[in-house]
Every structure is written in structure tokens, then in C-alpha cells.
């Protein structure tokens, strides 16, 4: 696996294992995971001390670490795309096994500001210094490594395995050897707490094979939150030693009989448990049997106890632990109910806001109210929503249907509306004629007029071309359809007399761009259409975004 020497420390309800091996963070997490754990958390100073202890144990065994400053992966990571967050203790990092953003941290230095790369945390150990409880390993952040390239100075990793509970180590009343095999496949002969479901092999005797006896025990849950080996009396007892060997294996007092036999006993205020070795307080609350914020309440005469939960919580089936009451089961809200630890909160659907009669009531948001309308032009409020409408000459546009876009009547589905030239304007259009022709009174047809070499007649006058009130223009486009950007003279469209076979557009207009600019301008010249043109006219590139502009690659101009 690439992970070699290991050390183990068990305390509370967790075991920590330290491994040497140059692995990436993902490989290290996979190694921990295969045995039912995760890369270790360091959520408090106490936990940091446990982790330091297991690393010290590893370093005593491991002489060949190559770097003076060695790093060991822990389970603190920041996913790709999640930015460093300086306002949080964990700086936007989170524990691989889940869990809340804990207040404890011990960063080595200011963190690198990044978002794109996945980042992982290792414990930084200066191997030239002794490991002292007052000098806990610092957290170092960096790339997570990859197979064959774990990252600079990575020497190993620390795993954490959590359990329902622990058994006390087996007590030997005479010479012998205990070997514990944990659920995470570690063997050890010296654990200060032994995790639930571990096996213990006891070989009694002083190494003389003829006198050796073997015993096998399993750490089981005897009662809720009570873990026990199921053995009774000290193991490997020998009349030769009596109480003189390891206090006879007794937890507190050892009493010898005249024949070399002995018994375990307890001090005042304590009682001997079923294993005939261990002593427990007579006050049942002294062992803190209640969990999860539950308070232990002594029963009459101090004989038994009950657990009591704070408001918003109730006892679970074990009667020892508090679980959140789901107040949302009673439907206390008008719309959405969100259960929270110890309480709940009401929320409203999109388009509604808190208000109205009663607790948790919701009322319709008037999206069309003055100052908050999302619509470019017309807005109609509906229950829980709204819809937009546009004035004549405009159609709804935009991803969310809130914008209004000018209808280019010059390229409408029915073909050009003018006999000759057509000038689209915001919300309307005008017809015009080629040189030598004049616009008929109907505003559409052209009649022969006096010969002129001037520009085509009919571009809209300044006063004619005004936008409709409330209209919008394409994003980042100028609002003037016939005037170029500042400092650009108004151009005259080039024209040629169209023929029936003509495939070319009658006019071409340049794309004008302010680059780079605060409000890039797009300038459109009028489209020119002729009743006899065989193919539809093309809109110049960079035109009003209401028109699908024909591009050289044959795609339309819209994304």
C-alpha cells in the first residue's frame, strides 16, 4: 500500500493511527477508509495532543525519515472551486468525514490565496525538536499531491477511527502477554483503551511453553454504553505472586487469602463490577452515562438515574442520548418549515415573503411594485410570481423573459414591409428610396423623382428615432441605431442597383467597437432591402441583438 510502520493511540471513543509512507492525500484517505476510518481530525487542543502522541510513538520506531521538516496528512481539505475564506477558523477548509466548522486551528503561516486547486492540510513536524505538549504540530496547507508525487516533505499520515465505546485493558494478575487486534487491523499489546469489537488474546505464563494457558476475549457492549470483555476475575493469577504482581490485576484494592489466593475490592463510595476486577462509583451519574447534551438526574436513594433533555430535544430509544425534535412534523408553517437543532424556522416560497396573519404566514411579493420591477417595460403581478410584457414594436427577450427587444420589422417573417429601403428604429421602422426615387404618400412605395446623386432618402430624423420609454437595448450596446460612437461621423450606406440574381447584401456596414471601453458601443447602419432582391438581405455583424446576424462560419450571432 505504500504505508508502512504504524503506531496507535486510543482515547475516549476514538483511536488514532500514524503511518509512514510517501502517499498523496487521496491515497492516504483511501488507506484510512479501507479500515473504516478517515484521515484524522484535529478539532481541539486535546485532540491535537492525542495526534501528537501517536506521531511521537511512530517517530520512536521510525528512524529513517528523510526530511528534517516532515509533514503528515490530516483530514482537512478544501475542494476545487472553493475559495480560501479568511473570516473562518478553518479558512474555508472542512473535515473529510464531515462535521461542523470547528473553532480550533493551528495554522503554520498565512495561507495561500487560491480557489481553483484542491488544497490539503498536513501536520508540520520539526524532527530536530522534541515533541512537547506545549508545542503542538502546526498545520501546513498545500497541493494534495498525486500518485508517485505526494508533495514536498510528505512522510506519512494520521488516521482516526471512531467507536461506540471502549473496553478497559485486560488486567493480568500474574505473568502473561495480552495481544489486542482492533477492528482496523492493528495489533498492539499496550492500549490504554481498547475499542469495541476488538479481540484480545491472553497467553499466561513466563514463557515456559508447558505452563502457558491461552484465553480469547471480545470487547462487547454489555448494556447501553457499557463495554466489557465478559471475563471474571484477574487473568493469569499465580499463588507464587499473590497481590504482588500488578496489584493482582485489581483496579483498586487487592486482598490476599492465606492460601495464596486473592480477591479484588473497592474503596468506599465504589462497588465491584461483574468482572470482579473493576470498581465503579456508587453514584450512577458519576460515569456520565447521558450523552448529547442530556443531563443525568439521580433517582430516589441514589440507586438509579434518568437522562433529561433540553427544550427542543427528546430522548432516543437508548434513553441516554438526546435527539432533535422535528417540530415540522406538526406543520407549524404556512409554506416551508425548516427543522433546526432544538427548534425550527418558517420560510416562504420564491415569490412570497413573511407576513400576514398568524405565526409563519407568508404573503405574495409584489414584484411589480415601484422600484423593484424586474421587467424592462410592462409588469403584471400574479400570486407568487409575475409576468412581463412589451409595448408594440418590441418582443420579450432575455434568458428570464424580463427584457424587451426591438422587433426588426425590416426582416420580419412576412418579408420586407417597404418596396425599397427599410430603416429599422427602436420600436418602429421607416421606408426609404434609392437615389432618383421618392417615397410615395403611402410611406411604403417609391416613385420616380428628380435625378439626385445624394444619399438614399428616408433615414429617420433625430426626433423620429427616439426609443420607446422603458425599452432596453442589447447588453453593452448603444441606444442609438443610426449614430456611430462618439467622434464617429454618421455614415452613408453604400448602394448598388439590385438585380434579380443578386446574392450579395445591398449594403454592408462596419462593426464599430470601443476597445477596451467602459460601455462598448455597437453601431448599426440601416438595413437595405429591395422588393426584387432574390435572397434575403444580411444584417451587418455587430447589429442589434434582436437580429440573428449571419456570420462567416454559418452560425447565427446568438449564443
Amino acid at each position: 500500500t505504500g504505508a508502512d510502520t504504524e503506531a496507535v493511540v486510543c482515547v475516549g471513543t476514538a483511536c488514532y493511527t500514524a503511518h509512514s509512507g510517501k502517499l498523496s492525500a487521496a491515497e492516504a484517505q483511501n488507506h484510512c477508509n479501507q479500515n473504516g476510518g478517515n484521515l484524522a481530525t484535529v478539532k481541539s487542543k486535546e485532540e491535537a495532543q492525542h495526534v501528537q502522541r501517536v506521531l511521537a510513538q511512530l517517530l520512536r520506531r521510525e528512524a529513517a525519515l528523510t526530511a528534517r521538516m516532515s509533514k503528515f496528512w490530516i483530514g482537512l481539505q478544501r475542494e476545487k472551486g472553493k475559495c480560501l475564506d479568511p473570516s473562518l477558523p478553518l479558512k474555508g477548509f472542512s473535515w473529510v468525514g464531515g462535521g461542523e466548522d470547528t473553532p480550533y486551528s493551528n495554522w503554520h503561516k498565512e495561507l495561500r490565496n487560491s480557489c481553483i486547486s484542491k488544497r490539503c492540510v498536513s501536520l508540520l513536524l520539526d524532527l530536530s525538536q522534541p515533541l512537547l505538549p506545549s508545542r503542538l504540530p502546526k498545520w501546513s496547507e498545500g497541493p494534495c499531491g498525486s500518485p508517485g508525487s505526494p508533495g514536498s516533505n510528505i512522510e506519512g499520515f494520521v488516521c482516526k477511527f471512531s467507536f461506540k465505546g471502549m473496553c478497559r485493558p485486560l488486567a493480568l494478575g500474574g505473568p502473561g502477554q495480552v495481544t489486542y487486534t482492533t477492528p482496523f487491523q492493528t495489533t498492539s499489546s499496550s492500549l490504554e483503551a481498547v475499542p469495541f469489537a476488538s479481540a484480545a488474546n491472553v497467553a499466561c505464563g513466563e514463557g515456559d511453553k508447558d505452563e502457558t494457558q491461552s484465553h480469547y476475549f471480545l470487547c462487547k457492549e454489555k448494556a447501553p454504553d457499557v463495554f466489557d470483555w465478559g471475563s471474571s476475575g484477574p487473568l493469569c493469577v499465580s499463588p507464587k505472586y499473590g497481590c504482588n504482581f500488578n496489584n493482582g490485576g485489581c483496579h483498586q484494592d487487592c486482598f490476599e487469602g492465606g492460601d495464596g489466593s486473592f480477591l479484588c475490592g473497592c474503596r468506599p463510595g465504589f462497588r465491584l463490577l461483574d468482572d470482579l476486577v473493576t470498581c465503579a462509583s456508587r453514584n450512577p451519574c458519576s460515569s456520565s452515562p447521558c450523552r448529547g447534551g442530556a443531563t443525568c438526574v439521580l433517582g430516589p436513594h441514589g440507586k438509579n438515574y434518568t437522562c433529561r433533555c433540553p427544550q427542543g430535544y427528546q430522548l432516543d430509544s437508548s434513553q441516554l442520548d438526546c435527539v432533535d425534535v422535528d417540530e415540522c412534523q406538526d406543520s407549524p408553517c404556512a409554506q416551508e418549515c425548516v427543522n433546526t437543532p432544538g427548534g425550527f424556522r418558517c420560510e416562504c416560497w420564491v415569490g412570497y415573503e413573511p407576513g400576514g396573519p398568524g405565526e409563519g404566514a407568508c404573503q405574495d411579493v409584489d414584484e411589480c411594485a415601484l422600484g423593484r420591477s424586474p421587467c424592462a417595460q410592462g409588469c403584471t403581478n400574479t400570486d407568487g410570481s409575475f409576468h412581463c410584457s412589451c409595448e408594440e414594436g418590441y418582443v420579450l427577450a432575455g434568458e428570464d423573459g424580463t427584457q424587451c427587444q426591438d422587433v426588426d420589422e425590416c426582416v420580419g417573417p412576412g418579408g420586407p414591409l417597404c418596396d425599397s429601403l427599410c430603416f429599422n428604429t427602436q420600436g418602429s421602422f421607416h421606408c426609404g428610396c434609392l437615389p432618383g426615387w421618392v417615397l410615395a404618400p403611402n410611406g411604403v412605395s417609391c416613385t420616380m423623382g428628380p435625378v439626385s446623386l445624394g444619399p438614399p432618402s428616408g433615414p429617420p430624423d433625430e426626433e423620429d428615432k427616439g426609443e420607446k420609454e422603458g425599452s432596453t437595448v442589447p447588453r453593452a450596446a448603444t441606444a442609438s441605431p443610426t449614430r456611430g460612437p462618439e467622434g464617429t461621423p454618421k455614415a452613408t450606406p453604400t448602394t448598388s442597383r439590385p438585380s434579380l440574381s443578386s446574392d450579395a447584401p445591398i449594403t454592408s456596414a462596419p462593426l464599430k467597437m470601443l476597445a477596451p471601453s467602459g460601455s462598448p458601443g455597437v453601431w448599426r447602419e440601416p438595413s437595405i432591402h429591395h422588393a426584387t432582391a432574390a435572397s434575403g438581405p444580411q444584417e451587418p455583424a455587430g447589429g442589434d441583438s434582436s437580429v440573428a446576424t449571419q456570420n462567416n462560419d454559418g452560425t447565427d450571432g446568438q449564443k
Epitope: 476545487k80 472551486g81 487560491s114 481553483i116
Partner: antibody, heavy 120, light 108 residues
Framework: QVQLQQSGAEVKKPGSSVKVSCKAS????????MHWVRQTPVYGLEWMGG????????AYNQNFKGRVTITADKSTSTAYMELSSLRSEDTAVYYC?????????????WGQGTTVTVSS | EIVMTQSPATLSVSPGERATLSCRAS???????LHWYQQKSGASPRLWIY???NLAFGIPARFSGSGSGTEYTLTISSLQSEDFAAYYC?????????FGGGTKVEIK
């Protein structure tokens, strides 16, 4: 002080590719991510993607459908943005930008911009 | 992706007057990840306000930013001649980063 110097304007044919460079100075190149934003008249400012020069990891805007490739050369402190299968609507000003010592993708430093014109 | 909608597209204001620019997100955005940029004609955008309400270095105190969730605002208490420019909002809550379409503040 931080400076981002971009390559000069380009005129390209539809279907071709363009590669714009951005040379960084005034800071350690691998300390900050480098991002690319373009500006067109119709679509305004669009984030194209970014790179972490320390690791070479990248993030892209999927709207560009794999046409964008961002790379970084640590030896020359230069980032590159290549856009392929050019079309007329790729005519834009292209900026390299980074957020320096600020957090949460607040783009503090910008190059001067490179105008790319796509025309047949 | 989150769509940022700025309104109005153009704001005509006289010098000395107050200007309020709006930026609306299609989904909720963390206030830490909402920024504003100023851009003048022919220049690159410049960071103006970061994390909703923090003025970038050298930005005058007449500018302020506020908002949360989907609604954000940039306010100029008393417009000066140098404030006439385009302003863009930008968000990040997962890729892609997106910008608003901009509000052009012009002299009335």
C-alpha cells in the same frame, strides 16, 4: 508593484486559433491564480477561465464548449489563453486578471487588454 | 449559472446628485463574493468595491455598497465629474464567475 503585460492586437480568420499572452511582474508568479475575461459589445464581460500556476490546475467556463485552453509557464512568469475555432462573435477585448491579496474572486489587477478581431 | 441583471442600463444624473445602481442575481449569492468594477472608455475594468461594501484602495468615500442574497446596490452620494463611467457587478458562487451587463452613468 503587480503588473500584467498582454500581447498585442490580433486579426484572425474564422475557424483559426488565437493565443494571447500575459506576462506577470512585481510578485511571485505562482502565488496568485491567473484568470481571463473577455469583453464584447453584445455579451459584455465574460469570464473564460483561470489557472493556478503552482499546480497547473484549471477551471473553465463551460459556455466556451472546450474551445479555451489556459496554460502557464513558470519559468517566464507568463500565462496564455488560447481560443480555437474562432467565429466572428469572438471579436472582443481579452483581459488577463488576478485577485492578488484580495479574497473571494475580487479581481484586483488587470492587463491592458488585447483586441482580437475575427474577420474573413 | 447565476445571471446578474443590472439596472438601469443607463443612468443620467447631474453632478452633485445621488446615484443608485442595482444588481440582481438569479440565485442567492454570498455577500463576500459580490464585487463592483468601474470601467472608463478605452480602459480596463478597475476593482471598485469588493465583498459588497468594502471600498478598494484609493476609492473615495462617496461610494458605498450594500445588499445581501439576490439584491445588491452601489450608491454614489454626490456624483463628481470623474464618476461618469460604466459600473459592473460580479459574483462567484461556483464556476462560472459572472458579470452584470453594466450600468452606464452619464451626465444629464
Amino acid at each position: 508593484q503587480v503588473q500584467l503585460q498582454q500581447s498585442g492586437a490580433e486579426v484572425k480568420k474564422p475557424g483559426s486559433s488565437v493565443k494571447v499572452s500575459c506576462k506577470a511582474s512585481g510578485y511571485t508568479f505562482t502565488d496568485y491564480e491567473m484568470h481571463w475575461v473577455r469583453q464584447t459589445p453584445v455579451y459584455g464581460l465574460e469570464w473564460m477561465g483561470g489557472i493556478d500556476p503552482e499546480t497547473g490546475d484549471t477551471a473553465y467556463n463551460q459556455n466556451f464548449k472546450g474551445r479555451v485552453t489556459i496554460t502557464a509557464d513558470k519559468s517566464t512568469s507568463t500565462a496564455y489563453m488560447e481560443l480555437s475555432s474562432l467565429r466572428s462573435e469572438d471579436t472582443a477585448v481579452y483581459y488577463c486578471t488576478n485577485y492578488g491579496n484580495l479574497y473571494y474572486y475580487a479581481m484586483d489587477y488587470w492587463g491592458q487588454g488585447t483586441t482580437v478581431t475575427v474577420s474573413s | 449559472e447565476i445571471v446578474m441583471t443590472q439596472s438601469p442600463a443607463t443612468l443620467s444624473v447631474s453632478p452633485g446628485e445621488r446615484a443608485t445602481l442595482s444588481c440582481r442575481a438569479s440565485s442567492s449569492v454570498s455577500s463576500s463574493y459580490l464585487h463592483w468594477y468601474q470601467q472608463k472608455s478605452g480602459a480596463s475594468p478597475r476593482l471598485w468595491i469588493y465583498s459588497t461594501s468594502n471600498l478598494a484602495f484609493g476609492i473615495p468615500a462617496r461610494f458605498s455598497g450594500s445588499g445581501s442574497g439576490t439584491e445588491y446596490t452601489l450608491t454614489i452620494s454626490s456624483l463628481q465629474s470623474e464618476d461618469f463611467a460604466a459600473y459592473y457587478c460580479q459574483q462567484y458562487s461556483g464556476y462560472p464567475l459572472t458579470f452584470g451587463g453594466g450600468t452606464k452613468v452619464e451626465i444629464k
